[in-house]
C-alpha cells in the first residue's frame, strides 16, 4: 500500500494527476461509520467542504483525495477531518514549463561518482494499475529501452551520463489521457576516494584570556565522512564542569568531502586552565593530526610573539 502524505508542504505541477492520502487510514477502516470530511481553504474562502460534486476533477476514496488533474486554482490549504483527528497540507500548484519536458522546480538532484553503480528506475506505485506505458527521457530526448512498463538504467556511471532524466508515466482515467513526470538531475563527479584529513589553522595557538571570563576554542577540519574530530583535555574528559564540548557541526562540501567544526567552551576561566594543552584531534584510518591551544593570561601577552595569538 502507498504510504500516506505526511509532508505538510507540497509543490506539484499543473495538469498532472495528484493525490493526498491522510495518515490515519488504518484507523479509518476500524471506524467505518465515522464521518470523514475533506476541506479546502484558500485566500478569502474558509473551509469549503470538498465532494465529487464540487469539481469533476476531484475523486474521494477511503483515505484519498484525488485530482484528475491538479490545476493552478487548486493551490491552498487542505484538511482531512475524522472525529478528533485532523491532518493539514499546504498545496502549491506551479505552472508547467511549456518549453521543456519537465519543470525545473520539480527536479530531484542526485550526485553519482564516476565508475560507481548508477541506477534510474521509473516506478509509480500509486497509479501503477492505471499506467499504460512509461517512457524515460534524457535531456528531453526519448531513450529506447527494453521495458516500456518500468524503464530502467543500471550501469557504472560515466561522465557522459550526466543530465536530466525524466520518467513520464502515461495513464488513462475516465477516457482521458494523463501523464505524470518525475525528473532527476544527475551530476557525475570525480571519484571521491579518501583525502588525508587536515586541521585548519596553525598547529599551536596561544589564546589571550582573562580570569573569570569565558572562551570558545574552535577546531575546524576538512575530513572524510567516517573520520572523527574530538577534544582532549585534562586526565579524563568531563571531569571539569566548566569545560564543555559543543555539538560538532559537519557540512558536505561540493566535492563530497566534509567540513567539520567542534567548539570547546571554557567558562569562568581559572588559574588551572592556564598554560595547559587543549588538544583537538582529527582521526582517520590513515592516522591522526592534532592542533593545540594554550590559554595565556592577557597580562602575560608581552612575553609571546604577536603572530602566535588567536582570538
Amino acid at each position: 500500500a502507498e504510504s500516506c502524505t505526511s509532508r505538510p508542504h507540497i509543490t506539484v505541477v499543473e495538469g498532472e494527476p495528484f493525490y493526498l492520502k491522510h495518515c490515519s487510514c488504518s484507523l479509518a477502516h476500524e471506524i467505518e461509520t465515522t464521518t470523514k470530511s475533506w476541506y479546502k481553504s484558500s485566500g478569502s474562502q474558509e473551509h469549503v467542504e470538498l465532494n465529487p460534486r464540487s469539481s469533476s476533477r476531484i475523486a474521494l476514496h477511503d483515505c484519498v483525495l484525488e485530482f484528475w488533474p491538479v490545476e493552478l486554482n487548486d493551490t491552498g490549504s487542505y484538511f482531512f477531518q475524522m472525529k478528533n483527528y485532523t491532518q493539514k497540507w499546504k498545496l502549491n500548484v506551479i505552472r508547467r514549463n511549456k518549453h521543456s519536458c519537465f519543470t525545473e522546480r520539480q527536479v530531484t538532484s542526485k550526485i553519482v561518482e564516476v565508475k560507481k553503480f548508477f541506477q534510474i528506475t521509473c516506478e509509480n506505485s500509486y497509479y501503477q494499475t492505471l499506467v499504460n506505458s512509461t517512457s524515460l527521457y534524457k535531456n528531453c530526448k526519448k531513450l529506447l529501452l527494453e521495458n516500456n512498463k518500468n524503464p530502467t538504467i543500471k550501469k557504472n556511471a560515466e561522465f557522459e551520463d550526466q543530465g536530466y532524466y525524466s520518467c513520464v508515466h502515461f495513464l488513462h482515467h475516465n477516457g482521458k489521457l494523463f501523464n505524470i513526470t518525475k525528473t532527476f538531475n544527475i551530476t557525475i563527479v570525480e571519484d571521491r576516494s579518501n583525502i588525508v584529513p587536515v586541521l585548519l589553522g596553525p598547529k599551536l595557538n596561544h589564546v589571550a584570556v582573562e580570569l573569570g571570563k569565558n572562551v570558545r576554542l574552535n577546531c575546524s577540519a576538512l575530513l572524510n565522512e567516517e573520520d572523527v574530530i574530538y577534544w582532549m583535555f585534562g586526565e579524563e574528559n568531563g571531569s571539569d564542569p566548566n569545560i564543555h564540548e559543543e555539538k560538532e557541526m559537519r557540512i558536505m562540501t561540493p566535492e563530497g568531502k566534509w567540513h567539520a567544526s567542534k567548539v570547546l567552551r571554557i567558562e569562568n576561566i581559572g588559574e588551572s586552565n592556564l598554560n595547559v594543552l587543549y588538544n583537538c584531534t582529527v582521526a582517520s584510518t590513515g592516522g591522526t593530526d592534532t592542533k593545540s591551544f594554550i590559554l595565556v593570561r592577557k597580562a602575560d601577552m608581552a612575553d609571546i610573539p604577536g603572530h602566535v595569538f588567536t582570538r
Epitope: E226, M232, E236, N237, R250, I251
Partner: antibody
Framework: QVQLVQSGAEVKKPGASVKVSCKAS????????ISWVRQAPGQGLEWMGW????????NYAQKLQGRVTMTTDTSTSTAYMELRSLRSDDTAVYYC?????????????????????WGQGTTVTVSS | AIQMTQSPSSLSASVGDRVTITCRAS??????LGWYQQKPGKAPKLLIY???SLQSGVPSRFSGSGSGTDFTLTISSLQPEDFATYYC?????????FGQGTKVEIK
C-alpha cells in the same frame, strides 16, 4: 540497515558481575561513541556512561564509578559494559545507544547522531 | 550533577489534543537538551535535539522550544501512536541526566 544487537537476558546473584555486549552493524563503528542507559522495572531512564570507540576514553555516572567498565572491540564492532558487585537494585533493562554529538548537514535535512540508534535492551535480573 | 525536573509526571489526553510537557534544568544548559519517546517494552526514540531541532524522520506535529533552564515539548495534534512516555535529556555536560518522564495516556 544501521542497528545495535545486544546479548541475551542474564540472571545473576548479588555480588556477581555481568558483561553485556552490543554489536553494531550498518555503519562505521569507530566513528561514533556508545552510551549505556538502564531502566529499572517501572522506573525512568538512567544514563550510565559513554565511551569514545575511536580512542577508548570513557565518562561514567558518579554513582557507578568503580563498579562499571565500558570497553570496545573495534575488530568485531562490539561494545561491552561490565557491572561488578551486583545488587538487587541493579535489576534493570540495559540499553546501548550510538551516541556522537554531531549534527550533519547534507542536503536539506540535518541529522543528529546523539543517541539516535538503540539496541533492543538486555534484561539483567539480580536475585539471590 | 545537573537535575532535570519534568512535569507533569502523567497526563490524560484525547486524539487531536494539543499536549505540552515541560522540563526544567537545575542550571543553565543553553540549548543542550533532547526529547525522547518510549513505548512499553521498546527502546527510546530521539524526537528533538538542541532544544528545538526536529530529528530527521520525526513527524512535524512534534516541536520543542526553550533555552537556559526551561524547555517545552509540544505535540500539536495528538495521534493514536503518540501515547507513550516522554523523557528530556541534558547533554550539556557529564554526567548526562534524564528527566523522570511524562506518561501520556488515553483519556
Amino acid at each position: 540497515q544501521v542497528q545495535l544487537v545486544q546479548s541475551g537476558a542474564e540472571v545473576k546473584k548479588p555480588g556477581a558481575s555481568v558483561k553485556v555486549s552490543c554489536k553494531a552493524s550498518g555503519y562505521t563503528f569507530n566513528s561514533y561513541g556508545i552510551s549505556w542507559v538502564r531502566q529499572a522495572p517501572g522506573q525512568g531512564l538512567e544514563w550510565m556512561g559513554w565511551i569514545r570507540t575511536y580512542n577508548g576514553n570513557t565518562n561514567y555516572a558518579q554513582k557507578l564509578q568503580g563498579r562499571v567498565t565500558m570497553t570496545t572491540d573495534t575488530s568485531t564492532s562490539t561494545a561491552y559494559m561490565e557491572l561488578r558487585s551486583l545488587r538487587s537494585d541493579d535489576t534493570a533493562v540495559y540499553y546501548c545507544a550510538r551516541d556522537e554529538a554531531r549534527i550533519v548537514v547534507a542536503g536539506t535535512t540535518p541529522y543528529y547522531y546523539g543517541m539516535d540508534v538503540w539496541g533492543q535492551g538486555t534484561t539483567v535480573t539480580v536475585s539471590s | 550533577a545537573i537535575q532535570m525536573t519534568q512535569s507533569p509526571s502523567s497526563l490524560s489526553a484525547s486524539v487531536g489534543d494539543r499536549v505540552t510537557i515541560t522540563c526544567r534544568a537545575s542550571q543553565d544548559i543553553r540549548n543542550d537538551l533532547g526529547w525522547y519517546q518510549q513505548k512499553p517494552g521498546k527502546a527510546p526514540k530521539l524526537l528533538i535535539y538542541a532544544a528545538s531541532s526536529l530529528q530527521s524522520g520525526v513527524p512535524s506535529r512534534f516541536s520543542g522550544s526553550g533555552s537556559g533552564t526551561d524547555f517545552t515539548l509540544t505535540i500539536s495534534s495528538l495521534q493514536p501512536e503518540d501515547f507513550a512516555t516522554y523523557y528530556c535529556l541534558q547533554d550539556y555536560n557529564y554526567p548526562r541526566t534524564f528527566g523522570q518522564g511524562t506518561k501520556v495516556e488515553i483519556k
